[in-house]
């Protein structure tokens, strides 16, 4: 497994590790913020979770998300998108039994309670970008990324590599 530090060792009791028949290679507990340092927060409303993008007050505590990393072999002849070789995928869970999901029909990002194994909609290809940022590309829809739209998370179609680094699909991960 990847080398993991103390804060990342949280989780084992919280999350059963067998997802889609494979175990995560490591897990990482982090707060998620936008390129412009707005925080991604999660609120329980009417028995379902809502996701917000907002500026936090000075001493307000950031919400944490558990990132579970998976190794993925991606042969181009199967995917048809010209991408091959090894890559890293993640699932994102802000609280027990809830995971971020890509709703490709609605172009939305939602929190769903689900059983294991997790559906493909809960998996995202993790991109290591410039400026200490990452991006999350939908496993189920190559070229579609989690992004920020109107103070919410949404799915944003990136038509070509020309738009891959627009700031609204860049996120920062932080242990604090």
């Amino acid at each position: 497994a990847f080398g993991i530090s103390g804060v990342q060792k949280y989780t084992r009791a919280l999350h059963d590790s067998s997802i889609t028949g494979i175990s995560p290679i490591t897990e990482y507990l982090a707060s998620l913020s936008t390129y412009n340092d707005q925080s991604i927060t999660f609120a329980l409303e009417d028995e379902s979770y809502e996701i917000y993008v907002e500026d936090l007050k000075k001493d307000e505590k950031k919400d944490k998300v558990l990132l579970s990393y998976y190794e993925s072999q991606h042969p181009s002849n199967e995917s048809g998108d010209g991408v091959d070789g090894k890559m890293l995928m993640v699932t994102l869970s802000p609280t027990k039994d809830f995971w971020l999901h890509a709703n490709n029909k609605e172009h939305s990002v939602e929190l769903h309670k689900c059983e294991k194994p997790l559906p493909d909609q809960a998996f995202f290809v993790l991109h290591n970008m410039h400026s200490n940022c990452v991006s999350f590309e939908c496993k189920t829809d190559p070229g579609v990324f989690i992004g920020v739209k109107d103070n919410h998370l949404a799915l944003i179609k990136v038509d070509s590599s020309e738009n891959l680094c627009t700031e609204n699909i860049l996120f920062k991960l932080s242990e604090t």
Partner: antibody, heavy 121, light 111 residues
């Protein structure tokens, strides 16, 4: 088959110039960050330069030892990456490898066979 | 710059035994809970080949005999059981940030 093929190496005098080319095949070139790394008996393996994607205006990074002398570029329509080397020095001698990072940009995944550059009078 | 110090510079190990190569970084190569440490094998006249990425994950087509471990600043590559074909140079490399740097290499001989 994923393949990277370098060309353009050879013998050049100190102070001279040379342009290396690398042609990629077997994958969608414009989705990948590309790098040049060189190897010599004296310095071992040494990263030279990296070029990212059109999205970030082809952000480029260079090793301190080549800054201002070397320029990395790419032509996605030709599936090619280049290394223009000016004001060459004896210490630039080595095998130059073209490298593709993995999808997602975490590590060096595919290496070309290399092309040899010799700087000598 | 992150300096990678590999040890030993060379070693000779008997067929079927275990070879262990170490790599120490001058500062942590961890970020996002991932160790940006990779291992490459290079045979004479060939380009380096990816063996292990992110400290402990095998590259495509790499036999299970090759394993990596470590985090932060201390990493190791293990080969067991050793085969004749494993005689080569081995390099560690970090990909955390530019400039990406390599270790000086370890020459592995089979006794």
């Amino acid at each position: 088959e994923v393949k990277l093929e370098e060309s353009g190496g050879g013998l050049v005098q100190p102070g001279g110039s040379m342009k290396l080319s690398c042609v990629a095949s077997g994958f969608t070139f414009n989705k990948f960050w590309m790098n040049w790394v060189r190897q010599s008996p004296e310095k071992g393996l040494e990263w030279v330069a990296e070029i990212r994607l059109n999205s970030i205006n082809y952000v480029k990074d260079y090793a301190e030892s080549v800054k201002g002398r070397f320029t990395i570029s790419r032509d996605d329509s030709k599936n090619s990456v280049y290394l223009q080397m000016n004001n060459l020095r004896a210490e630039d001698t080595g095998i130059y490898y073209c490298i593709r990072r993995n999808y997602g940009n975490w590590f060096f995944e595919i290496w070309g066979a290399g092309t040899t550059v010799t700087v000598s009078s | 710059d992150i300096v990678l110090t590999q040890s030993p510079a060379s070693l000779a190990v008997s067929l079927g035994q275990r070879a262990t190569i170490s790599c120490r970084a001058s500062e942590s190569v961890d970020r996002y809970g991932i160790s940006f440490m990779n291992w490459f094998q290079q045979k004479p006249g060939q380009s380096p080949k990816l063996l292990i990425y992110a400290a402990s994950n095998q590259g495509s087509g790499v036999p299970a005999r090759f394993s990596g471990s470590g985090s932060g600043t201390d990493f190791s590559l293990n080969i067991h059981p050793l085969e004749e074909d494993d005689a080569a140079m081995y390099f560690c490399q970090h990909s955390k940030e530019v400039p990406y740097t390599f270790g000086g290499g370890t020459k592995l001989e089979i006794k």
